[in-house]
C-alpha cells in the first residue's frame, strides 16, 4: 500500500520534520551513497543494506495509533473486508466514532442474539470493513505495530501488507490480531495460506481478555499448515505475528468464523435420570432420582451464556441414604447405600418410617441379598430401637407376603461388616388405614380389585405383564381381605417371574430370559413355543440380546426344535426383526451349567406379534431426512421401494429394496446421513496430488504438487471443512500448475557502482536498480526488468558509471545522462 505524504507524521511531541515517502527512500540511499567499496558493500555481498541505520541525528518516525482527540492523524492502514479484499480504510480501534463515510463494526452486545453469520445463517449479507492497523517506524529497535480488534462473525486475517516502500525497508514486526465474537460463540479458523520464513513466528491463542483468564496457546508456526482448521472454545482468539526482520515469506491468510457453543450433555446420575430442554444457553437440565434415592445437589441446572457456555452448577447425584426418618410416609422405598465411598465398608443404617395417625405400614421385600455371616437386617414394629422385632435376617426367612406393623411406625436397621458378597436391599413400604388391608403390590404385574379402598371383603386379582408368569402358578390368582376386627389378606401375594420356557398363544407378547430383569443363572435349557392363528405368521423383534459367551438362543421356524432353523443368536446383538413363514415359532435358550462365563449376561427381551399371512414383506419404518416411494400399494412379492434423501443428506445402504419370494427384503433399509465428505476436488494438470483420506471426509487434506518446470498457482493444500448450513466445502479452489520461467542471472555490477539488494537470480517480472558512487554518473537504464521467456531476458544491458563532470547530487539519484 503506497504511503501518502500526509500519512507520515511526527510522533506527538517530537521535532522530526514531516517527510514524504520518496524522501524516506532518498535517506536510505543517501546513507549508502556515502558508503564506498571500503565500507564493505561489495558486489555479491549478502549483507542487507536495507537494515542500515540512518546517519546520526536523522531518525524517521511514523506515529503510533492516533488518539480520539486527534482525528486528523491516521497511520498506515490495511483494510480487510469479510470477503478478504484489501483496501484502504479507517483505522484506530480507539476512535470513538468512525470517520465520515466509513462503517465500524458494533461492539458485541449481550442483548444481541448472536454474531452476524452472513447469508448462510439466513441473514441478508452485510459487508463491514475490518481494519488491520500497521504503524511503521524506521528506528530499528522499535517494532512495527499492526494491531487490530475484530468483532465480525466471519472474515479473513492477513499478514501486514509488505508492498509499501516503508514496509520493505524496515525491520521488526510485532502484530496482534484480536478476534472477538459474541459470548456463547467460539471461533473457528482455517489457515488458507501460510508461507513464513524460519525467523517468523505466528501464534494462535484462545481466550484472554478477561481478568484472571490467560490466553491458552492453540498452535504455533511449526504446528500450523495450510488448510488446517483450529477451533477456539472461547469467544476470543488472538493471532500474534512476529518477524525480527523484513518478512521474506509470503505471509499468511487466515479465514475465521464464529460458531455456536453449547453446554456438554450433563451425565445421567446413577439411580436417576436427567431430561434436557436444550444444550444451548438458556436450556435447562432437570434431574430426578429413582424411588429410594435422594437428590444430592441442585434439581435443575441452567446452561449459562458466557465465553464458554457451562451449566450453573455441579451435576447432582442420587444417593441412597444410610438411615433417616421418613415422616407422613405413604409409599416409597428404602435402598441400601453403595458400599465403600462416603459410608465405608462397615454400615450401620437405621431408618424410621412414620405413617400418619391411624395408619399402619406394609413392608414388601423387593430385593434382598445379604451376606449370611456379615450382614444383618432387623425390622421392628414401632419407632424405636426397643420396639418388638418382627423380622431378623439371622433368624427368619424373607417373608414372601411382607411385613405389617402393629403401630404407625417401622424401625429398620441394617448392619454390614465388610461383606464378602455385595449387599443388595430394596424394601417397598406403603401406609394403609388400620380398618382395611394394605394395597397389594405385584412387580411386573397388575392388580385389579373390587374395592380400591381394600376394606374387608375386597378381592384383589393378579395378572402378570407379557413375558412373566404367576409364581406360584394357577389359581387362586386372587386374594380376599378378611376379618373386619383385624383386616388382613387371606393369602400371600403371588410374584411375577420371567420363566424358563412356556407356551404362548396370544396375538402379541414378549419372551424374556429367565429371571428378567435380573441376570439369568447358568444351567438353562428353556424352550418357548409361540402360536398364533392358523392363517397368520409371527414377526419377532429382538429388542435386547445380551447373553454370555457360549450361551445361545435358537429360533425354529415351526412347532418344536425339529423345525427349520430361522436364526441362531449369540453374544450382544443389535435390534433386528425376523419373520416366521407360518403360525408357529419355537425359541430355545441354552446356557451351559457351571460358573458363569465372563460377559454381560444380562439376558434378552424379544417382542412377537402375529401379522397377516397375505404374502407381503414386513412393513419398514419410513426414513428420516428422506422419503421412499413404493411401486405397489401393498408390499407384495416384487414390490420395489426406492429411497431418496433430501438436500444435505446422502443414502447409506441400498437405494432400492425388493420384496423377495420368501417375503423378506433384499437388503436392510438404508438411512439418510448428513453429508460429511467433500466432493473429489479433481486431479491437476502437470502435477499430482496426495490425499490424507480416501473419500475426502471432513478434516481431510489434499496436497497438490507440480511437475518439474511448473510452479503452483494457488493453495498447495486444500482442507475439507464442515458448515452449519450446506454440505462440506474445500477450503480453497484447486490450484494450477503454470509453466515456470527460468530466472534471469544477475548481469553484474557496473564498475564504480552498485545494485540494491544483490542476488544471483531474478524471477520473471522482478526489477533490478543500479546506482553509481559519488563522483560518477549513470549511463544507460537505471532499472532493468527480467522479461519472462525461455530463457528469460533483461530488458536492456546494465548501465555504466562514468566519471561525472559535476557534483550535483540530484543527478546521481535520477540516473540522468
Amino acid at each position: 500500500l503506497p504511503l501518502k505524504e500526509e500519512e507520515i507524521l511526527p510522533e506527538p511531541g517530537s521535532e522530526t520534520p514531516t517527510v514524504a515517502s520518496e524522501a524516506l527512500a532518498e535517506l536510505l540511499h543517501g546513507a549508502l551513497l556515502r558508503r564506498g567499496p571500503e565500507m564493505g558493500y561489495l558486489p555479491g555481498s549478502d549483507r542487507d543494506p536495507t537494515l542500515a541505520t540512518p546517519p546520526a541525528g536523522q531518525t524517521l518516525a511514523v506515529p503510533s495509533l492516533p488518539r480520539a482527540t486527534e482525528p486528523g492523524t491516521g497511520p498506515l492502514t490495511t483494510a480487510v473486508t469479510p470477503n478478504g479484499v484489501r483496501g484502504a480504510g479507517p483505522t484506530a480501534p480507539e476512535l470513538l466514532t468512525p470517520p465520515p463515510g466509513t462503517t465500524a463494526p458494533p461492539p458485541p452486545s449481550p442483548a444481541s442474539p448472536g454474531p452476524p453469520l452472513g447469508p448462510e445463517g439466513g441473514e441478508e449479507e452485510t459487508t463491514t470493513t475490518i481494519i488491520t492497523t500497521t504503524t511503521v517506524t524506521t528506528t530499528v529497535t522499535s517494532p512495527v505495530l499492526c494491531n487490530n480488534n475484530i468483532s465480525e462473525g466471519e472474515g479473513y486475517v492477513e499478514s501486514p501488507d509488505l508492498g509499501s516502500p516503508v514496509s520493505r525497508t524496515l525491520g521488526l514486526l510485532d502484530c496482534t490480531y484480536s478476534i472477538h465474537v459474541y459470548p456463547g460463540y467460539g471461533i473457528e479458523i482455517q489457515v488458507q495460506t501460510l508461507n513464513l520464513s524460519q525467523e517468523e513466528e505466528l501464534l494462535v491463542l484462545a481466550g484472554g481478555g478477561s481478568p484472571g483468564l490467560a490466553p491458552r496457546l492453540l498452535a504455533n508456526s511449526s504446528m500450523l499448515g495450510e488448510g488446517q482448521v483450529l477451533r477456539s472454545p472461547t469467544n476470543r482468539l488472538l493471532l500474534h505475528f512476529q518477524s525480527p526482520r523484513v518478512p521474506r515469506g509470503g505471509g499468511f491468510r487466515i479465514h475465521y468464523q464464529a460458531y455456536l457453543l453449547s453446554c456438554g450433555f450433563p451425565p445421567r446420575p446413577a439411580h436417576g435420570d436427567v431430561s434436557v430442554t436444550d444444550l444451548h444457553p438458556g436450556g435447562t437440565a432437570t434431574f430426578h432420582c429413582d424411588s429410594g434415592y435422594q437428590l444430592q445437589g441442585e434439581e435443575t441446572l441452567i446452561c449459562l451464556n458466557g465465553t464458554r457456555p457451562s451449566w450453573n452448577g455441579e451435576t447432582p447425584s442420587c444417593m441412597a441414604s444410610c438411615g433417616g426418618t421418613i415422616h407422613n410416609a405413604t409409599l416409597g422405598r428404602i435402598v441400601s447405600p453403595e458400599p465403600g465411598g462416603a459410608v465405608g465398608p462397615n454400615l450401620t443404617c437405621r431408618w424410621v418410617i412414620e405413617a400418619a395417625e391411624g395408619r399402619r405400614l406394609h413392608l414388601h421385600f423387593e430385593r434382598v441379598s445379604l451376606d449370611e455371616d456379615n450382614d444383618r437386617l432387623m425390622v421392628r414394629s414401632g419407632g424405636s430401637p426397643l420396639s418388638p422385632v418382627i423380622y431378623d435376617s439371622d433368624m427368619d426367612d424373607v417373608p414372601e407376603r411382607g411385613l405389617i406393623s402393629d403401630a404407625q411406625s417401622l424401625y429398620v436397621e441394617l448392619l454390614s461388616e465388610t461383606p464378602a458378597n455385595p449387599l443388595l436391599l430394596s424394601l417397598r413400604f406403603e401406609a394403609f388405614e388400620e380398618d382395611r388391608c394394605f394395597a397389594p403390590f405385584l412387580a411386573h404385574g397388575n392388580v385389579t380389585t373390587t374395592d380400591p379402598e381394600y376394606r374387608p371383603g375386597a378381592l384383589a386379582t393378579f395378572s402378570c405383564l407379557p413375558g412373566y408368569a404367576l409364581e406360584p402358578p394357577g389359581p387362586p390368582n386372587a386374594i380376599e381381605c378378611v376379618d373386619p376386627t383385624e383386616p388382613h389378606w387371606n393369602d400371600t401375594e403371588p410374584a411375577c417371574k420371567a420363566m424358563c420356557g412356556g407356551e404362548l398363544s396370544e396375538p402379541a407378547g414378549v419372551v424374556l430370559s429367565p429371571d428378567w430383569p435380573q441376570s439369568y443363572s447358568p444351567g438353562q435349557d428353556c424352550v418357548w413355543g409361540v402360536h398364533v392363528q392358523e392363517e397368520k405368521r409371527i414377526l419377532l423383534q429382538v429388542e435386547i440380546l445380551n447373553v454370555r459367551e457360549g450361551d445361545m438362543l435358537t429360533l425354529f421356524d415351526g412347532d418344536g426344535p425339529s423345525a427349520r432353523v430361522l436364526a441362531q443368536l449369540r453374544g450382544p446383538q443389535p435390534r433386528r426383526r425376523l419373520l416366521s413363514s407360518g403360525p408357529d415359532l419355537t425359541l430355545q435358550f441354552q446356557a451351559p451349567p457351571g460358573p458363569p462365563n465372563p460377559g454381560l449376561g444380562q439376558g434378552f427381551v424379544l417382542h412377537f406379534k402375529e401379522v397377516p399371512r397375505n404374502d407381503t414383506c414386513p412393513e419398514l419404518p419410513p426414513p428420516e431426512w428422506g422419503w421412499r416411494t413404493a411401486s405397489h400399494g401393498d408390499l407384495i412379492r416384487g414390490t420395489v421401494l426406492t429411497y431418496q434423501c433430501e438436500p444435505g443428506y446422502e443414502l447409506l445402504g441400498s437405494d432400492i429394496l425388493t420384496c423377495q419370494w420368501d417375503l423378506s427384503w433384499s437388503a436392510a433399509p438404508p438411512a439418510c446421513q448428513k453429508i460429511m465428505t467433500c466432493a473429489d476436488p479433481g486431479e491437476i494438470a502437470n502435477g499430482h496430488r496426495t490425499a490424507s483420506d480416501a473419500g475426502f471426509p471432513v478434516g481431510s487434506h489434499v496436497q497438490y504438487r507440480c511437475l518439474p518446470g511448473y510452479s503452483l498457482e494457488g493453495a498447495a493444500m486444500l482442507t475439507c471443512y464442515s458448515r452449519d448450513t450446506g454440505t462440506p466445502k474445500w477450503s480453497d479452489r484447486v490450484p494450477k500448475c503454470a509453466l515456470k520461467y527460468e530466472p534471469c542471472l544477475n548481469p553484474g555490477v557496473p564498475e564504480n557502482g552498485y545494485q540494491t539488494l544483490y542476488k544471483h537470480h531474478y524471477q520473471a517480472g522482478e526489477s533490478l536498480r543500479f546506482f553509481c558512487y559519488e563522483g560518477f554518473e549513470l549511463i544507460g537504464e537505471v532499472t532493468i526488468t527480467c522479461v519472462p521467456g525461455h530463457p528469460s531476458q533483461w530488458t536492456s544491458q546494465p548501465p555504466l558509471c562514468k566519471v561525472t563532470q559535476t557534483t550535483d547530487p540530484s543527478r546521481q539519484l535520477e540516473g540522468g545522462n
Epitope: E624, T629, Q644, P647, T725, K729
Partner: antibody, heavy 120, light 112 residues
Framework: EVQLVESGGGLVQPGGSLRLSCAAS????????MSWVRQAPGKGLEWVAL??????????EYSASVKGRFTISRDNSKNSLYLQMNSLRAEDTAVYYC???????????WGQGTLVTVSS | DIVMTQTPLSIPVTPGEPASISCRSS???????????LYWYLQKPGQSPQLLIY???NLASGVPDRFSGSGSGTDFTLKISRVEAEDFGVYYC?????????FGAGTKVEIK
C-alpha cells in the same frame, strides 16, 4: 392420479399479506414432502419453502429471500398446503407453484400455479 | 449457496436437428454414493415445469429417449438427439445437493 391445485393469488399492496393454498388429492398427503416454487414474470424458477412429511415431523426449510416473512404449513386433515406471505415486496410478484416429492426428487409433481402481484 | 450457470441463454434449433445445453455448478454435485444430484426440467410456454432427467442421467417416466443427460462433478449437459415440435420451451437445471435448492437461469430452445 396426483393432483395439486393452487389458489389464493391476487393483487396486494407492498407490506401487505396473502395466504396461498394448495389442495392435494390422489395420494396419502402425510407421506410426502411439499414445496412452493415461484417464477417472476419472464424470469426463471426459484425455490421458496419446503415442509417435510409425517415421518420427519413436518419440519420446514426456507430460502433466504423469504425467511422470516413467509410461513409454510399444512393441514393434513384437509390435504392442504399453505403459504402465509407477510411484508410482501414488489420482488415477490410471481407465479407460485405447489410441488410434491416422489420417485424423481423433490419436484416430481407440480400444480398449475397461482399469480401473486405486489404493487401499489 | 450453490450457483447454477446455464449456457447458452437461448438456442435457435431447426426441428430434426440435435441440440445441446450446458449447466455448470459452483460446487461438485457428486455424492459419495456416486450419484450426481442434478435435475433437468422443461417448461413449455404457459405450462408448469415438468421433470425430464433426475440424478444427471436418468430419464423420468414418460420422457422420450431422444433426451439424454451426462456430465461429471460440476459440468453437465442435456442433449436432444433430434428436436421435435413439443421440445421447444425453457430448460432449467437444478441442484438438490444442499439447501437452498437452486435452479439455473434457464435456456430457451426456440424454432430457428
Amino acid at each position: 392420479e396426483v393432483q395439486l391445485v393452487e389458489s389464493g393469488g391476487g393483487l396486494v399492496q407492498p407490506g401487505g399479506s396473502l395466504r396461498l393454498s394448495c389442495a392435494a388429492s390422489g395420494f396419502t398427503f402425510t407421506d410426502y414432502y411439499m414445496s412452493w416454487v415461484r417464477q417472476a414474470p419472464g424470469k426463471g424458477l426459484e425455490w421458496v419453502a419446503l415442509i417435510r412429511n409425517k415421518a420427519n415431523g413436518y419440519t420446514t426449510e426456507y430460502s433466504a429471500s423469504v425467511k422470516g416473512r413467509f410461513t409454510i404449513s399444512r393441514d393434513n386433515s384437509k390435504n392442504s398446503l399453505y403459504l402465509q406471505m407477510n411484508s410482501l415486496r414488489a420482488e415477490d410478484t410471481a407465479v407460485y407453484y405447489c410441488a410434491r416429492n416422489g420417485l424423481y426428487g423433490l419436484f416430481a409433481y407440480w400444480g398449475q400455479g397461482t399469480l401473486v402481484t405486489v404493487s401499489s | 449457496d450453490i450457483v447454477m450457470t446455464q449456457t447458452p441463454l437461448s438456442i435457435p434449433v431447426t426441428p430434426g436437428e440435435p441440440a445441446s445445453i450446458s449447466c455448470r455448478s459452483s460446487t461438485s454435485l457428486l455424492e459419495s454414493s456416486g450419484k450426481h444430484r442434478l435435475y433437468w426440467y422443461l417448461q413449455k410456454p404457459g405450462q408448469s415445469p415438468q421433470l425430464l432427467i433426475y440424478y444427471m442421467s436418468n430419464l423420468a417416466s414418460g420422457v422420450p429417449d431422444r433426451f439424454s443427460g451426462s456430465g461429471s462433478g460440476t459440468d453437465f449437459t442435456l442433449k436432444i438427439s433430434r428436436v421435435e415440435a413439443e421440445d421447444f420451451g425453457v430448460y432449467y437445471c437444478m441442484q438438490s445437493l444442499e439447501y437452498p435448492l437452486t435452479f439455473g437461469a434457464g435456456t430457451k430452445v426456440e424454432i430457428k
